[in-house]
């Protein structure tokens, strides 16, 4: 039975009975705000295998695992997401494990598991087997792994039942609970699903199947479901619906949905039954179910009740799909996201006119504004304080506004403001002034020439290296003295360097969504002697390590509106000399007889050259009393023991607090104060958490029904 169009279970746990016969939830599933701790053991929904949108759990008291509720939930399709997430587990006070041991696929979207104080078995799940990309997963504020003592089935009895995979360089067993392994299909199946007996499913199956190579035995479909069969495409006279099944024209004509109370009803276009015609198409007559191409962009006016529309996620951008004229103001604040540019283009790419202002701030995920690919007019009917109608502030990775060779954008009224966009060249801003017709409107402080483009490559001349010398931890380089037209414009040089195992770095590498930079920077003053070539000694480097180095000339950015030419070198790759290797890692010894030891180890993390041999030394030692201090039969009391890796175990530090001043030589230091960048990153992280929490609260707290 298909249940829909989204099920919201709140306040009373007995509402769960609504899920009794559901095999597929066509829509979302919310289970939330059940404040009285209940016994959920009598509730079990083995029929539920697929949720087409997302699963949200929030403040459900007494629920300790989802495994008993949904033992066969196999696929969450993520056709629509909750703030970019397909699985959200938030503030579940009693949840001890997720336990969705049959969950095999989250087709779209990431997961957010946050503020679940008792939740364990998070590090034992390999999400990369379930999701395409794990980089946007947000798993924070749950029970610390050290307090969990997660053990996969059979580990205690030394008969491990689960398979191992590598996550963050840790090769470990993968499981959902103390008695449920994470299922992995044989490598022979490739990307196909498999049965419980490890037989490969039909290619059209997703997640699992009850019989091998049979498109009628799938638990869920990779593409579409029709009349009991998984099909790669919907058969003639049927249409794709909600991203997972095929329906007929009559079904589509009769849909009356709370989500699309639009009086015109659903349409059939390009083989799909959808809420409205897609971008570039319009209904063939007001009551038609069919779409025809628009001549030019289709007009669609969208209005924001609150005047200003904040775009802070894919979900919020989704509301603007198909809009060509936006009546109001746009505030773009995209801090992170997966495939964000194409998602934004998909939902905002048709906007041609914004009647108010456009403000882009703290959008560290944006490199370009080209996702607004049809924006041609900002009317500036409403302006920000200071009469700004285009305002760009603190976007750490923004490098390009638009491709001005192929873009006509007019700002009818209001000024522009640019500040703290470190990768946005001032020349790009000046170009925008010319194209948009705002040149002369801005006052001196509106385009900050010091903090825009400060970390960008805005140069036009090439600097050439003249010599390089290396030792085990030093590199000396020199380069041609650069002579701009006016020698007074040259202030100094900046040398950028970083480790580069491969010769594939760009100067924009290592800048994450929060704007951090992986390059080290050193300033080099101009030698007073005009005949001496500038150079630098880079020290404190690692032996036998390839570094990437480039140099930039720091020039005066502007002299009476003349644009000064800058200069920059190509990236040079250079390797330091070899040195003594670091200690071998993960030394393990085991006795296989009364007179023999077998010793194993891993290579050193820093070989500092090509290793040729190892030296093994040994000596007799007294028995370690530590071995008798713990009950090894209790999973909760297993001490977390790491083999020495050169770092200080946090537990050891807390046992022996050290009070030396930072930099003291007597012992381990206390933690150094956080850098400004770290503080900023923490602040932004906290802000991002708040934004999500607000979104969550705004979405789920609704007036009580009549």
């Amino acid at each position: 039975e298909i249940c829909g169009p989204g099920i919201d279970i709140r306040n009373d746990y007995q509402q769960l009975k609504r899920l009794e016969n559901c095999t597929v939830i066509e829509g979302y599933l919310h289970i939330l705000l059940i404040s009285k701790a209940e016994d959920y053991r009598s509730y079990r929904f083995p029929k539920l295998t697929v949720i087409t949108e997302y699963l949200l759990l929030f403040r459900v008291a007494g629920l300790e695992s989802l495994g008993d509720l949904f033992p066969n939930l196999t696929v969450i399709r993520g056709w629509k997401l909750f703030y970019n997430y397909a699985l959200v587990i938030f503030e579940m006070t009693n949840l001890k494990d997720i336990g969705l041991y049959n969950l095999r696929n989250i087709t779209r979207g990431a997961i957010r598991i946050e503020k679940n104080a008792d939740l364990c078995y998070l590090s034992t799940v390999d999400w990369s087997l379930i999701l395409d990309a794990v980089s946007n997963n947000y798993i924070v504020g749950n029970k610390p792994p050290k307090e969990c003592g997660d053990l996969c089935p059979g580990t205690m009895e030394e008969k491990p039942m689960c398979e191992k995979t590598t996550i963050n360089n840790e090769y470990n067993y993968r499981c959902w609970t103390t008695n449920r392994c994470q299922k992995m299909c044989p490598s022979t199946c490739g990307k196909r699903a498999c049965t419980e007996n490890n037989e490969c499913c039909h290619p059209e199956c997703l997640g699992s199947c009850s019989a091998p190579d049979n498109d009628t035995a799938c638990v869920a479909c990779r593409h579409y479901y029709y009349a009991g069969v998984c099909v790669p495409a919907c058969p003639p006279n049927t249409y794709r619906f909600e991203g997972w099944r095929c329906v007929d024209r009559d079904f589509c004509a009769n849909i009356l949905s709370a989500e699309s109370s639009d009086s015109e009803g659903f349409v059939i276009h390009d083989g799909e039954c959808m809420q409205e015609c897609p971008s570039g198409f319009i209904r063939n007559g007001s009551q038609s179910m069919y779409c025809i191409p628009c001549e030019g962009p289709c007009p669609k006016v969208c209005e924001e009740e609150k005047k200003t529309k904040t775009i802070d996620s894919v979900t919020s951008a989704q509301m603007l799909q198909g809009c060509t004229i936006f009546k109001g103001n746009l505030l773009i604040n995209i801090r992170r996201g997966n495939n964000i540019a194409s998602e934004l283009e998909n939902f905002m790419g048709l906007i041609e006119v914004v009647t108010g202002y456009v403000k882009i701030r703290h959008s560290h995920a944006l490199v370009s504004l080209s996702f607004l690919k049809n924006l041609r007019l900002i009317l500036g009917e409403e302006q920000l304080e200071g009469n700004y109608s285009f305002y760009v502030l603190d976007n750490q990775n923004l490098q390009q506004l638009w491709d001005w060779d192929h873009r006509n954008l007019t700002i009818k009224a209001g000024k522009m403001y640019f500040a703290f966009n470190p990768k946005l060249c001032v020349s790009e801003i000046y170009r925008m002034e010319e194209v948009t017709g705002t040149k002369g409107r801005q006052s001196k402080g509106d385009i900050n020439t010091r903090n825009n483009g400060e970390r960008a490559s805005c140069e036009s001349d090439v600097l050439h290296f003249t010599s390089t010398t290396t030792s085990k931890n030093r590199i000396i380089i020199t380069w041609h003295r650069y002579r701009p037209p006016d020698y007074r414009d040259l202030i100094s040089f900046t040398v950028y360097y970083k480790e580069a195992p491969f010769k594939n770095v760009t100067e924009y590498d290592g800048q994450d969504a929060c704007g951090s930079n992986s390059w080290n920077m050193v300033d080099v003053d101009l030698p007073p002697n005009k005949d001496v070539e500038p150079g630098i000694l880079l020290h404190g480097l690692k032996p036998w390590t390839q570094y990437a180095v480039y140099v930039k000339a720091v020039t005066l950015t502007m002299v009476e509106n003349d644009h000064i030419r800058g200069a920059k070198s190509e990236i040079l790759y250079i390797r330091t000399n070899a040195s003594v290797p670091s200690i071998p890692l993960d030394v393990l010894s085991a006795s296989n007889s009364s007179s023999q030891l077998i010793v194993k180890w891993n290579p050193p993390s820093l070989p500092n050259g090509n290793l040729s041999y190892y030296i093994v030394r040994w000596q007799r030692q007294p028995q370690d009393g530590y071995l008798y201090r713990h009950n090894y039969c209790s999973k909760d009391k297993i001490p977390i023991r790491k083999y020495a890796d050169g770092t200080i175990d946090i537990e050891e530090v807390t046992e022996n607090p050290k009070t030396e001043v930072c930099g003291g030589e007597k012992g381990p230091c206390c933690a150094c104060p956080k850098t400004e960048a770290e503080k900023q990153a923490e602040k932004e992280e906290a802000e991002y958490r708040k934004v999500f929490e607000n979104f969550l609260h705004n979405s789920i707290f609704v007036p009580r029904p009549e």
Partner: antibody, heavy 117, light 112 residues
Framework: QVQLQESGPGLVKPSETLSLTCTVS?????????WNWIRQPPGKGLEWIGY???????NYKPSLKDRVTISRDTSKNQFSLKLSSVTAADTAVYYC??????????WGQGTLVTVSS | DIVMTQSPLSLPVTPGEPASISCRSH???????????LQWYLQKPGQSPQLLIY???NRLYGVPDRFSGSGSGTDFTLKISRVEAEDVGVYYC?????????FGQGTKVEIK
């Protein structure tokens, strides 16, 4: 997929209130569609009584408006019919049905209510 | 209320022969949006009604093509090109264009 099931007393005394409940499974009554009551006196034709919209608003047949109330319990995914001051003329098979943008697509199997003292 | 009048009220037919049912409204049932929400339902003995035709002439997916609907404004017709034994039952027209919906009184189709 969507199922509707009528329930309620099969016998009601004249002048009392007839109460029926329709339990919906497979679709949330707040998610869309119009949730209707239709009746059919024995050996006669179908008569539309009214509906409750997914947003909770109502529409009733004018001649029954003073006696009829259609309400819902969203937590149980049910909607109900109350018909007051019944007479023998209200004896009928009562159907609940879902109506979309264009037509009735799902019907309950019907429940006979007899008005008799 | 819009009154929907069906005729005939009873229609004895021979299998394989055509049949036609008329439905008239006393005023136009064209909705303000241009659509005419006129449906035909069949109620077989002991069953709930089932849809055959919607919006005057659109045959529901799975309904045999011997059924067809036509008409406009106030006059509508359901035709069965060749009646089969399984087609017996009561046929109702229904209008959903006006705010208060109404059924016709029904036409009973039976085999001679």
């Amino acid at each position: 997929q969507v199922q509707l099931q009528e329930s309620g007393p099969g016998l009601v005394k004249p002048s009392e209130t007839l109460s029926l409940t329709c339990t919906v499974s497979g679709y949330s009554i707040t998610g869309g569609y119009l949730w209707n009551w239709i009746r059919q006196p024995p050996g006669k034709g179908l008569e539309w009584i009214g509906y409750i919209h997914y947003d909770g608003t109502n529409n009733y047949k004018p001649s029954l408006k003073d006696r009829v109330t259609i309400s819902r319990d969203t937590s149980k995914n049910q909607f109900s019919l109350k018909l007051s001051s019944v007479t023998a003329a209200d004896t009928a098979v009562y159907y609940c049905a879902r109506h979309g943008r264009v037509f009735f697509d799902y019907w309950g199997q019907g429940t006979l209510v007899t008005v008799s003292s | 209320d819009i009154v929907m009048t069906q005729s005939p009220l009873s229609l004895p037919v021979t299998p394989g022969e055509p049949a036609s049912i008329s439905c008239r409204s006393h005023q136009s049932i064209v909705h303000s949006n241009g659509n005419t929400y006129l449906q035909w339902y069949l109620q077989k003995p002991g069953q709930s009604p089932q849809l055959l035709i919607y919006k005057v002439s659109n045959r529901l997916y799975g309904v045999p093509d011997r059924f067809s609907g036509s008409g406009s404004g106030t006059d509508f017709t359901l035709k069965i090109s060749r009646v089969e034994a399984e087609d017996v039952g009561v046929y109702y027209c229904f209008q959903g264009s006006h705010v208060h919906w109404t059924f016709g009184q029904g036409t009973k189709v039976e085999i001679k």
